[in-house]
């Protein structure tokens, strides 16, 4: 899986979308998890409604919401009041039994609020060094790694 980078502004909301094949994943609940390092386990943050037919209902865990358009094949995650500690590697998952298929790997980056000068030195501004080398910018809020490219491994 390539990793898609989504950039959000501190204090604002960030929407992450994960497209999938609606037929292949028919009847499956979805989940959003935070990965503890590139090779680490993925800790569940929030999952869609227990009843698949009600997956369109938004479910919250703290400041993170999930909703699933099962016909259109798009899982949407909302991170409200984005903070620096929300930065990291995540996965959109399709659940079946005790197994989980990865729909998309996502790197969340937190940008500085251009109107907030108090902590301007604490957050990343576009134009400075990025987490990925030669990353292809698709949109202002997301980009994908080139084929075969991996996120910089390690620090803890």
């Amino acid at each position: 899986h390539n990793t898609t980078v989504f950039q959000g502004v501190a204090g604002q909301s960030l929407q992450v979308s994960c497209p999938y094949d609606s037929m292949k994943h028919w009847g499956r609940r979805k989940a959003w998890c935070r990965q503890l390092g590139e090779k680490g386990p993925c800790q569940r943050v929030v999952s869609t409604h227990n009843l698949w037919l009600l997956s369109f209902l938004r479910r919250w865990n703290g400041s993170t919401a999930i909703t699933d358009d099962t016909l259109g094949g798009t899982l949407t995650i909302t991170l409200r009041n984005l903070q620096p500690h929300d930065a990291g590697l995540y996965q959109c998952q399709s659940l079946h039994g005790s197994e989980a298929d990865t729909l998309r790997k996502v790197l969340v980056e937190v940008l500085a609020d251009p109107l907030d000068h108090r902590d301007a030195g604490d957050l990343w501004f576009p134009g400075e060094s990025e987490s990925f080398e030669d990353a292809h910018v698709e949109h202002s809020i997301s980009r994908s790694l080139l084929e075969g490219e991996i996120p910089f491994p390690p620090t803890s």
């Epitope: 996120p151 910089f152 620090t155 803890s156």
Partner: antibody, heavy 120, light 107 residues
Framework: QVQLVQSGAEVKKPGASVKVSCKAS????????IHWVRQAPGQGLEWMGW????????KYAPKFQGRVTITADTSTSTAYMELSSLRSEDTAVYYC?????????????WGQGTLVTVSS | DIQMTQSPSSLSASVGDRVTITCHAS??????LSWYQQKPGKAPKLLIY???NLHTGVPSRFSGSGSGTDFTLTISSLQPEDFATYYC?????????FGQGTKVEIK
């Protein structure tokens, strides 16, 4: 018990090469990135490079590029660091270090260190 | 390369003291900073990852804070076993780089 065990101390002459091994036990090295970090006597820590044993991908610090080679043998769960064209400034303790990569790894294991002395 | 600058380079403190070590990155590194403790003749030990997360088994008197370019390691009440050298390390980009270290000595 999870641990990384490194090979013993080495004494080398300037211009020679040294190959240090790092054997993992209690876990599979394919599930980790293996880094090499060195520390000259009385000095700080210096990151040299890493390998992903799962696919053999490696990356080196520019300072060591062309002089260091990091490899891994998954069948023996062992990683290796070879440093060539040794000079006296390469005298240091060399550590191997395993983690799950960037972005919040909670796993962190270190070898006991291998002292490499370069002296004529 | 991203330069990591620690201060102070050394400090003397007594058991029970509150100790603060700072680490400054030459570029933005978000929260991708770790703190290590090293004792003479031993390998480093991870204390804090992702700027503020306490590693398993690390006493709660250790805490980390910061994001972007400025980070802090705090020991709320120094214990005899805490006398050691502390290093910060950035994990935003390669090569990973360490601070020069802060040696915490007994006053």
């Amino acid at each position: 018990q999870v641990q990384l065990v490194q090979s013993g101390a080495e004494v080398k002459k300037p211009g020679a090469s040294v190959k240090v091994s790092c054997k993992a036990s209690g876990f599979s090295i394919e599930d980790f990135y293996i880094h090499w970090v060195r520390q000259a006597p009385g000095q700080g820590l210096e990151w040299m490079g890493w390998i992903d044993p799962e696919n053999g991908d490696s990356k080196y610090a520019p300072k060591f590029q062309g002089r260091v080679t990091i490899t891994a043998d998954t069948s023996t769960s062992t990683a290796y660091m070879e440093l060539s064209s040794l000079r006296s400034e390469d005298t240091a303790v060399y550590y191997c270090h395993a983690d799950h990569g960037n972005y919040g790894s909670t796993m962190d294991y270190w070898g006991q260190g291998t002292l490499v002395t370069v002296s004529s | 390369d991203i330069q990591m600058t620690q201060s102070p380079s050394s400090l003397s403190a007594s058991v029970g003291d509150r100790v603060t070590i700072t680490c400054h990155a030459s570029q933005h590194i978000n929260v991708w900073l770790s703190w290590y403790q090293q004792k003479p003749g031993k390998a480093p030990k991870l204390l804090i990852y992702k700027a503020s997360n306490l590693h398993t088994g690390v006493p709660s008197r250790f805490s980390g804070s910061g994001s972007g370019t400025d980070f802090t390691l705090t020991i709320s009440s120094l214990q005899p076993e805490d006398f050691a050298t502390y290093y910060c390390q950035q994990g935003q980009t390669y090569p990973r780089t360490f601070g020069q270290g802060t040696k915490v000595e007994i006053k």
